[in-house]
Interface confidence: medium
């Protein structure tokens, strides 16, 4: 089959843009750390990089291969208000590199960490 | 309370970066359109803008207020392979503006669309 080169270029561009790589995402601080329901953060979210995008095959998953940690200062508010908003510094995982890994490898990796 | 102004600025900057706005995301084409399990797309994902980020309150949700449509050409593969990959042009919703809306309003909006 003969394909229009413009179509091939645009498809290639789509591959590029959707590849598995660190992407800027908004993380809900409370959900990330499973804090008490009476504790709130302002802002409620922080911006970090996490692996995301698509892999070429169903059996692959976009996973982080290296991680740094970012310290961010937020206001913590505990209800009922015993005091005003308190600045707290929290460390967030920031994915610095990613790879499409087989889901089986991911499963093994996670379970080996749990077993330690 | 006395606050370090550098902290106040960095907190404000976090609000800015996590605000509800159109964000570039990867959409799984098959999941987006609920296609048959024997149909695959290459690439499997496309890059579009969708509303994302955080709202200031639990009762608010980041929702699109305006949408454009982008046409993207992909290869469609049907198993068993009766023919080679076939170029198909598909239209994807691309969010162009967003707003934090009350979850109640979102619920009403969705249900009014369903009822029509």
């Amino acid at each position: 089959a003969h394909y229009n080169t413009e179509i091939l270029k645009s498809i290639d561009n789509e591959w590029r843009k959707t590849q598995c790589m660190p992407r800027e995402v908004c993380i809900d601080v409370g959900k990330e750390f499973g804090v008490a329901t009476n504790t709130f953060f302002k802002p409620p979210c922080v911006s970090v990089y996490r692996c995301g995008g698509c892999c070429n095959s169903e059996g692959l998953q976009c996973m982080n291969t290296s991680t740094s940690y970012l310290s961010k200062t937020l206001f913590e508010i505990t209800v009922p208000l015993s005091q005003g908003p308190k600045p707290v510094t929290i460390s967030f995982a920031n994915h610095t590199s990613c790879r499409c890994m087989s889901k089986l490898d991911v499963y093994r990796q996670v379970h080996s960490i749990i077993r330690r | 309370a006395h606050y370090n102004t550098e902290i106040l600025k960095s907190i404000d900057n976090e609000w800015r970066k996590t605000q509800c706005m159109p964000r570039e995301v990867c959409i799984d084409v098959g999941k987006e359109f609920g296609v048959a399990t024997n149909t695959f797309f290459k690439p499997p994902c496309v890059s579009v803008y969708r509303c994302g980020g955080c709202c200031n309150s639990e009762g608010l949700q980041c929702m699109n207020t305006s949408t454009s449509y982008l046409s993207k050409t992909l290869f469609e593969i049907t198993v068993p392979l009766s023919q080679g990959p076939k170029p198909v042009t598909i239209s994807f919703a691309n969010h162009t503006s967003c707003r934090c809306m009350s979850k109640l309003d979102v619920y009403r909006q969705v249900h009014s669309i369903i009822r029509r």
Partner: antibody, heavy 122, light 107 residues
Framework: EVQLVESGGGLVQPGGSLRLSCAAS????????IHWVRQAPGKGLEWVAV????????YYADSVKGRFTISADTSKNTAYLQMNSLRAEDTAVYYC???????????????WGQGTLVTVSS | DIQMTQSPSSLSASVGDRVTITCRAS??????VAWYQQKPGKAPKLLIY???FLYSGVPSRFSGSGSGTDFTLTISSLQPEDFATYYC?????????FGQGTKVEIK
């Protein structure tokens, strides 16, 4: 050209109220913090309050806390200072001032309005 | 609150003179100090921010230095338009506080 224009000053009796406005133009209003700074006749400068029009965060000097409220209307590019329970010591020229840039580490006021005089007297 | 103490409170100088104004903070404020110039009946103008950075459009004869608690504003060669009151301001913590001012007069 960046401009800040205050209005709403005047003579008010002790215990009275007044609302000052600061109309901003020539820059993206949500990109900068907006401060109110006052200067009593023949005296030095005193910071009053600040707002981030972007997030709505506000901070006040202890001398005005509970009596003054700073707010911003991003659709009008205007900041306000609602002053209640006014006292003689609140008499001053009130300036609104723009913070230099949200990316700078610390507050520094790069543009100021012309000021509006508030006189609290019976 | 952090106190900012300026000295001198006033000084007389001639055109061409080198003028130095100092400001002392009651506690460490890192480099979070700005300097302003104010003329009678006018709003203050920003000269220096973050202790030593010259604000855009400000003549290079103005310079700032210092960190921690001691800060200096220097005018290398005083010009006729420089006769005014100068204020230092810390913004390390809320509330930002100003010095009491230094009035530079013609000798």
């Amino acid at each position: 050209e960046v401009q800040l224009v205050e209005s709403g000053g005047g003579l008010v009796q002790p215990g009275g109220s007044l609302r000052l406005s600061c109309a901003a133009s020539g820059f993206t209003f949500t990109d900068n913090w907006i401060h109110w700074v006052r200067q009593a006749p023949g005296k030095g400068l005193e910071w009053v309050a600040v707002i981030s029009p972007y997030s709505g965060a506000t901070y006040y000097a202890d001398s005005v806390k509970g009596r003054f409220t700073i707010s911003a209307d991003t659709s009008k590019n205007t900041a306000y200072l609602q002053m209640n329970s006014l006292r003689a010591e609140d008499t001053a020229v009130y300036y609104c001032a723009r913070d230099a840039d949200y990316k700078y580490a610390f507050w520094a006021f790069d543009y100021w309005g012309q000021g509006t005089l508030v006189t609290v007297s019976s | 609150d952090i106190q900012m103490t300026q000295s001198p409170s006033s000084l007389s100088a001639s055109v061409g003179d080198r003028v130095t104004i100092t400001c002392r903070a009651s506690q460490d404020v890192s480099t979070a100090v700005a300097w302003y110039q104010q003329k009678p009946g006018k709003a203050p103008k920003l000269l220096i921010y973050s202790a030593s950075f010259l604000y855009s459009g400000v003549p290079s004869r103005f310079s700032g230095s210092g960190s921690g608690t001691d800060f200096t504003l220097t005018i290398s060669s005083l010009q006729p338009e420089d006769f005014a009151t100068y204020y230092c301001q810390q913004s390390y913590t809320t509330p930002p506080t100003f010095g009491q001012g230094t009035k530079v007069e013609i000798k």
